[in-house]
């Protein structure tokens, strides 16, 4: 499965649009700092496409979801967040025909589960940060900086997964 | 491979303007904020300020506030350092150093060569 | 402002010995930083985050402490490590660094 040369600019227009959606002065938000234990190595080169599109569509599965509760609602640009959602959307449909094509039917489903759940945690994780800090604005740029940090990394393992072939 | 590349030393005179520059390479100029430290003959680190290249916010030590101006050009991934009137006090050793802002990462973890810094009547 | 207040200001020691650098914060923080500083050269990065080692930072030195108090601790000293250590909180603007603790051969 290829995934289309729009695939890469909507990945890097969400990334603008994360930019973008930034409110307050980062400065102030530095004491709430946090490790949110990004998954890297569910992320690394030694994946197979056919193991790495369940991996990524569930990355941004799990973005769309985050962003698109009511206290995401209140904490961001209503028109920059219908802009992200339609990207996200978008990626989404492209990674959904991959699987739907079978890519990855012949791989041991165990590590894709693995994969899939790691990723899961780690939203997990942020979710009950945003919760614990009362989705306060810095707790939500902190969040927004995390997963610009972590889109990137995976965009960037789409990118070397294109080179590869 | 990470780079900071700091512009040359520099010789003014007290009362003269000087902008120093600071230019990024291997990593994504944008995602990280530059510090700037000063260190005076023989003496040790002062945080001066920093800026985040996205958008150009600045915050800066309560001791350089209004004595330096902070800045960035993101199409050139360069960050300077500038004074509109420099004094013989000025006279130091300059690092820039890169932070990850907001993020879980090391804090200035690559640093400039750092310019020195000469100001002589 | 946070002050970094560090301690001793200069020691003396002699390779293979173990070292002790201490930092303590004017108040609560959760975030830091250990430097390396030789003659002529910028700043190294040597632990983060109170006691995370920075990558290819030799094993020998490690962090520890929370809240105000902060160690660093050289193992067993190599002659590569005379040079000036300084410690930095990166908990809040503005960052504030400790004064330095210079380590000489004896």
């Known amino acids: 499965c290829d995934l289309p040369q729009t695939h890469s600019l909507g990945s890097r227009r969400t990334l603008m649009l994360l930019a973008q959606m930034r409110r307050i002065s980062l400065f102030s938000c530095l004491k709430d700092r946090h490790d949110f234990g990004f998954p890297q190595e569910e992320f690394g080169n030694q994946f197979q496409k056919a193991e790495t599109i369940p991996v990524l569509h569930e990355m941004i599965q799990q973005i769309f979801n985050l962003f698109s509760t009511k206290d995401s609602s209140a904490a961001w640009d209503e028109t920059l967040l219908d802009k992200f959602y339609t990207e996200l959307y978008q990626q989404l449909n492209d990674l959904e025909a991959c699987v739907i094509q079978g890519v990855g039917v012949t791989e041991t489903p165990l590590m894709k589960e693995d994969s899939i759940l790691a990723v899961r945690k780690y939203f997990q994780r942020i979710t009950l940060y945003l919760k614990e800090k009362k989705y306060s604005p810095c707790a939500w740029e902190v969040v927004r900086a995390e997963i610009m940090r972590s889109f990137s990394l995976s965009t960037n393992l789409q990118e070397s997964l294109r080179s590869k072939e | 491979e990470v780079q900071l590349v700091q512009s040359g030393a520099e010789v003014k005179k007290p009362g003269e303007s000087l902008k120093i520059s600071c230019k990024g390479s291997g990593y994504s100029f944008t995602s990280y904020w530059i510090g700037w430290v000063r260190q005076m003959p023989g003496k040790g680190l002062e945080w001066m300020g920093i800026i985040d290249p996205s958008d150009s916010d600045t915050a800066y030590s309560p001791s350089f506030q209004g004595q330096v101006t902070i800045s960035a050009d993101k199409s050139i991934s360069t960050a300077y350092l500038q004074w509109s009137s420099l004094k013989a006090s000025d006279t130091a050793m300059y690092y820039c150093?890169?932070?990850?802002?907001?993020?879980?990462?090391?804090?200035?973890?690559?640093w400039g060569q750092g310019t020195l810094v000469t100001v002589s009547s | 402002d946070i002050q970094m207040t560090q301690s001793p200001s200069s020691l003396s020691a002699s390779v293979g010995d173990r070292v002790t650098i201490t930092c303590r914060a004017s108040?609560?923080?959760?975030?830091l930083n250990w430097y390396q500083q030789k003659p002529g050269k910028a700043p190294k990065l040597l632990i983060y985050?109170?006691?995370s080692l920075q990558s290819g930072v030799p094993s020998r030195f490690s962090g520890s402490g929370s809240g105000t108090d902060f160690t660093l601790t050289i193992s067993s000293l190599q002659p590569e490590d005379f040079a000036t250590y300084y410690c930095q909180q990166g908990y809040d603007t503005p960052f504030t660094f400790g004064q330095g603790t210079k380590v000489e051969i004896k």
């Open positions: 985050w109170a006691s």
């Open positions: 108040q609560s923080i959760n975030n």
């Open positions: 150093a890169r932070h990850p802002g907001l993020n879980w990462a090391p804090d200035f973890d690559y």
